[in-house]
Interface confidence: medium
């Protein structure tokens, strides 16, 4: 998987009226990696692993980024034109990738209300709208917004992959991103479920990167996809990743079951506890 | 109390250029979120939206007619202005300016009429 | 463009009665649909915004219903004084677009 850096911002408005303040998180491949705190109005690191990113370096250069994106987003929502009464909001998420082949990609996009209207590659600056017509009039105000000044805008974008770009080499020099390899814990458990069967949930949690086979076997047979069931893979908020897997079985046969776990190279099997 | 006038010259030869005006009080074009259309209609028909302009000077016409029509404002003096390059007939209508912010038009004029005729 | 369509395109009402006009978007518009009258010689009055919010000013037997592409204005108890022409408008998406109008006649 690439690594990427992605952020995510969030302004609203009452009543026509921009609000102030602004919510931000940042993830770094894939992990919860920023937020903005906005009781102190500074950027703030998600969890040990985000601190040992940048080491013993302040956060004021990520608080100023975060703090001047929001103030654009601000400006942005300021200028859509026909706002309701009431609660609504402005997002973007802007996301860039170094790939294993050390091409890149940067991507924009904006959504009001929570609906996608307005896409843009960043290195290319094509936009792209979706079809449905609010969709095109929320990217036409937007847009006439953006390139009211066609070279400063030309420049911020050119600007925002760059700066993207450039934070994420950053965050990946420190080698903790890199480097890191963190070996699952499972946990595997058993509940009751109907009359002469159990359900046996396999857990793995705490583990980096995020790719992981978890699945369940019968004899050293791993069972059809349609037995068993899976959780999603999701962070932790620790830097690392959780996930899981069910099946239900005859109360008995517990010690033909095993759960097998492949985690970057390594794998190991866990059996049911009795 | 909010009022909007609409004044225009009356009558028109075809392939003239049509220039009107909106007058208004009691709200400002400064103001984040207003906008001030042109809505006209011919005698005994509908309505047909035409242009807007908003405070921050942002422009939409109706595509249909957008080759011409041209509008702008005078925040200062509190006035809108409306261009339609080459009317023909088709163009006798009652004109309309109205206010509108969050997505409606809620105060209108009382309409200028224009009548094309050779 | 979304086309409004309206009906009936004439109503012809006794007063007391409560009636129904119809607004029908070419594609879906959620709410954001408005209601204008009209009485003859004089402009357009906003009644109704967003399908169903009341208007501060407009008499409460006006109402509007619906939302994607079907809506509908009622008037619970018609007076004499509502006579004119009804039109709803798109206020979903660019180009703003009127329904031909709906006019209500007292028998």
């Known amino acids: 998987e690439p690594h990427s850096l992605r952020y995510n911002l969030t302004v609203l408005s009452w009543d026509g009226s921009v609000q102030s303040g602004f919510l931000a998180e940042v993830h770094l491949d894939g992990q919860p990696f920023l937020r903005y705190d906005r009781q102190k109005c500074r950027a703030k690191p998600q969890g040990q692993w985000a601190e040992d990113v940048l080491g013993n370096k302040t956060w004021d250069r990520e608080t100023r980024d975060l703090t001047g994106n929001g103030k654009d987003l601000r400006m942005t929502l300021a200028h859509i034109k026909d706002q309701k009464e009431g609660l609504h909001s402005l997002q973007e998420i802007r996301v860039c990738e170094i790939h294993e082949d050390n091409s890149t990609r940067s991507s924009q996009h904006f959504y009001y209300d929570g609906e996608l209207f307005l896409s843009q590659n960043l290195e290319t600056e094509e936009w792209t709208v979706p079809q449905s017509s609010r969709a095109q009039t929320l990217a036409m105000n937007v847009r006439n917004f953006l390139k009211e000044d066609a070279m400063k805008t030309k420049t911020h974008y050119h600007a925002m992959h760059a700066d993207c770009l450039q934070e994420l080499r950053r965050y990946l020099e420190s080698g903790v991103v890199l480097r890191r390899t963190v070996p699952p814990m499972v946990n595997v458990t058993r509940s009751e479920a109907s009359e002469g069967n159990i359900t046996v949930t396999c857990r793995a949690s705490s583990f980096y990167p995020r790719n992981i086979i978890l699945t369940w076997r019968q004899d050293g047979v791993s069972l059809s996809h349609d037995t068993q069931q899976w959780g999603d893979v999701l962070p932790d908020g620790n830097g690392t990743y959780q996930t899981w897997v069910a099946t239900r079985i005859c109360r008995g046969e517990e010690q033909r079951f095993t759960c097998y776990m492949e985690h970057s190279g390594n794998h190991s099997t866990h059996p049911v506890p009795s | 109390q909010i009022t909007l006038k609409e004044s225009g010259p009356g009558i028109l030869k075809p392939s003239q250029t049509l220039s009107l005006t909106c007058s208004f009080s009691?709200?400002?074009?400064?103001?984040?979120?207003?906008?001030v259309g042109w809505i006209r209609q011919p005698s005994g028909k509908g309505l047909e939206w035409l242009a807007h302009?908003?405070?921050?000077?942002?422009?939409y016409y109706n595509p249909s007619l957008k080759s011409q029509l041209t509008i702008s404002k005078d925040t200062s003096r509190n006035q809108v202005f409306l261009r339609i390059t080459s009317v023909d007939t088709a163009d006798t209508a009652t004109y309309y300016c109205?206010?509108?912010?969050?997505?409606?038009?809620?105060?209108w004029g009382q309409g200028t009429t224009l009548t094309v005729s050779s | 463009d979304i086309v409004m369509t309206q009906s009936p395109a004439t109503l012809s009402v006794t007063p007391g009665d409560r009636v129904s006009l119809s607004c029908r978007a070419s594609?879906?518009?959620?709410?954001?649909l408005h209601w204008y009258q009209q009485k003859s010689h004089e402009s357009p009055r906003l009644l109704i915004k967003y399908a169903s919010q009341s208007i501060s000013g407009i008499p409460s037997r006006f109402s509007g219903s619906g939302s994607g592409s079907d809506f509908t204005l009622s008037i619970n108890s018609v007076e004499p004084e509502d006579v004119g022409v009804y039109y709803c408008?798109?206020?979903?998406?660019?180009?703003?677009?009127f329904g031909g109008g709906t006019k209500l006649e007292i028998k």
């Open positions: 594609q879906s518009i959620s709410d954001y």
């Open positions: 009691g709200f400002s074009l400064s103001t984040s979120g207003m906008g």
């Open positions: 109205a206010r509108r912010t969050q997505g409606y038009f809620d105060y």
């Open positions: 302009i908003w405070w921050d000077d942002d422009k």
């Open positions: 408008q798109n206020g979903h998406s660019f180009p703003w677009t």
